[in-house]
């Protein structure tokens, strides 16, 4: 799988969707979870509704929420309120049994100033944050890592 | 692929001034800023600055507020630098640079870069 | 403005050799919302552009020889070059994307004997 790049805003939600095949998938319930370390287990944040049917109900766990779209084929997860301390690798899972198959890796990363605090198009410095709470715009910035290029930080 | 061609070398005397071009290609022109780099004969990089492809709002390094300027040509895909009133001190090779995308600003696309040399 | 100082200035080595250019900003270069050190480094042979060697002070460009290795965190950083080659012989730059201007450092002149 490769991973997906979103960046947020500090203090401000995040949207992540993971898409996949509805027929593939079909009847199975969904999961986001934590990757703890580069080869840790992968620690359940927050899952859909206990009845398939209902996972279109917004679930949440503290400040993160979960949806489901089973027909589109989409995976809705939004972090409230971003922290510097939520980024990291996650996981989007599909669950069967006590199995789950990985939908698509996240690397949620968080930018320390808000985006509309910029002209469209400017290069952004996380040294030049800024004070902002009362930003309530929602943003999320998405791409896939380079070839090569490692999700975890240096440990040295 | 992903390409930036800059314009030929320049001889200037001092006190005129010259216009630099930066013909991208492989990518969308308006997505990324284009910036600018100097190296003086024998010397280091030095960051001019950038330009916003979006809106064409220029950003310089306080070294290069001066008698340097900026400009895009979106519809070319090309971004210019001019110098005016050129100086000894100008003489330089000028690269213009991609960062991977505006929020990971390493450079991972440079032009080949324009000598501009400046003698009376 | 953050203030770069690489050392040393310049040195000759041995092909098979080992090397190790240093790197210092005047800030740290850490950011807290992603873990990562906002740090590249960029090899410029005779005659050519820069080309990016390492960024995130860590992370290999694609396609650069697993010999080249970035290291340090914070305000200190290293390239290590290990059994330096023929082909190395160029100059070296760090540079920091963490505020602007973005800086560099002055150069480390890599030479062969």
């Known amino acids: 799988h490769n991973t997906t790049v979103f960046q947020g805003v500090a203090g401000q939600s995040l949207q992540v969707s993971c898409p996949y095949d509805s027929m593939k998938h079909w009847g199975r319930r969904k999961a986001w979870c934590r990757q703890l370390g580069e080869k840790g287990p992968c620690q359940r944040v927050v899952s859909t509704h206990n009845l398939w049917l209902l996972s279109f109900l917004r679930r949440w766990n503290g400040s993160t929420a979960i949806t489901d779209d089973t027909l589109g084929g989409t995976l809705t997860i939004t972090l409230r309120n971003l922290q510097p301390h939520d980024a990291g690798l996650y996981q989007c899972q599909s669950l069967h049994g006590s199995e789950a198959d990985t939908l698509r890796k996240v690397l949620v990363e968080v930018l320390a100033d808000p985006l509309d605090h910029r002209d469209a198009g400017d290069l952004w410095f996380p040294g030049e944050s800024e004070s902002f709470e009362d930003a309530h715009v929602e943003h999320s910035i998405s791409r896939s890592l380079l070839e090569g290029e490692i999700p975890f930080p240096p440990t040295s | 692929q992903i390409q930036l061609v800059q314009s030929g070398p320049e001889l200037k005397k001092p006190g005129e001034s010259l216009k630099i071009s930066c013909k991208a290609s492989?990518?969308?022109?308006?997505?990324?800023?284009m910036q600018w780099v100097k190296q003086a004969p024998e010397k280091g990089l030095q960051y001019m600055g950038w330009?916003?492809?979006?809106?064409?709002?220029?950003t310089y390094a306080d070294d290069f507020k001066e008698r340097f300027v900026f400009s895009l040509e979106t519809s070319a895909t090309t971004a210019y630098l001019q110098i005016n009133n050129l100086k000894n001190e100008d003489m330089a090779t000028y690269f213009c640079?991609?960062?991977?995308?505006?929020?990971?600003?390493?450079?991972?696309?440079w032009g080949q870069g324009t000598l501009v040399t400046v003698s009376s | 403005d953050i203030v770069m100082t690489q050392s040393p200035s310049s040195l000759a080595v041995s092909a098979g050799e080992t090397v190790t250019i240093n790197c210092k900003s005047s800030?740290?270069?850490?950011?807290?919302?992603?873990?990562?050190?906002?740090l590249a480094w960029y090899q410029q042979k005779p005659g050519q552009s820069p080309k990016v060697l390492i960024y995130?002070?860590?992370t290999r460009q694609f396609g650069v020889p697993d010999r080249f290795i970035g290291s340090g965190s914070g305000t200190d950083f290293t390239l290590t070059i290990s059994s330096v080659q023929a082909e190395d012989l160029a100059i070296y730059y760090c540079?920091?994307?963490?505020?602007?201007?973005?800086?560099f450092g002055s150069g480390t002149k890599l030479e062969i004997k």
């Open positions: 492989g990518y969308t022109f308006t997505d990324y800023a």
């Open positions: 330009i916003n492809t979006q809106t064409g709002k220029p």
């Open positions: 995130w002070a860590s």
């Open positions: 640079v991609r960062s991977y995308n505006n929020y990971e600003n390493w450079f991972a696309y």
């Open positions: 800030q740290s270069l850490l950011y807290s919302g992603n873990q990562k050190n906002y």
């Open positions: 540079q920091q994307y963490y505020n602007s201007p973005i800086t």
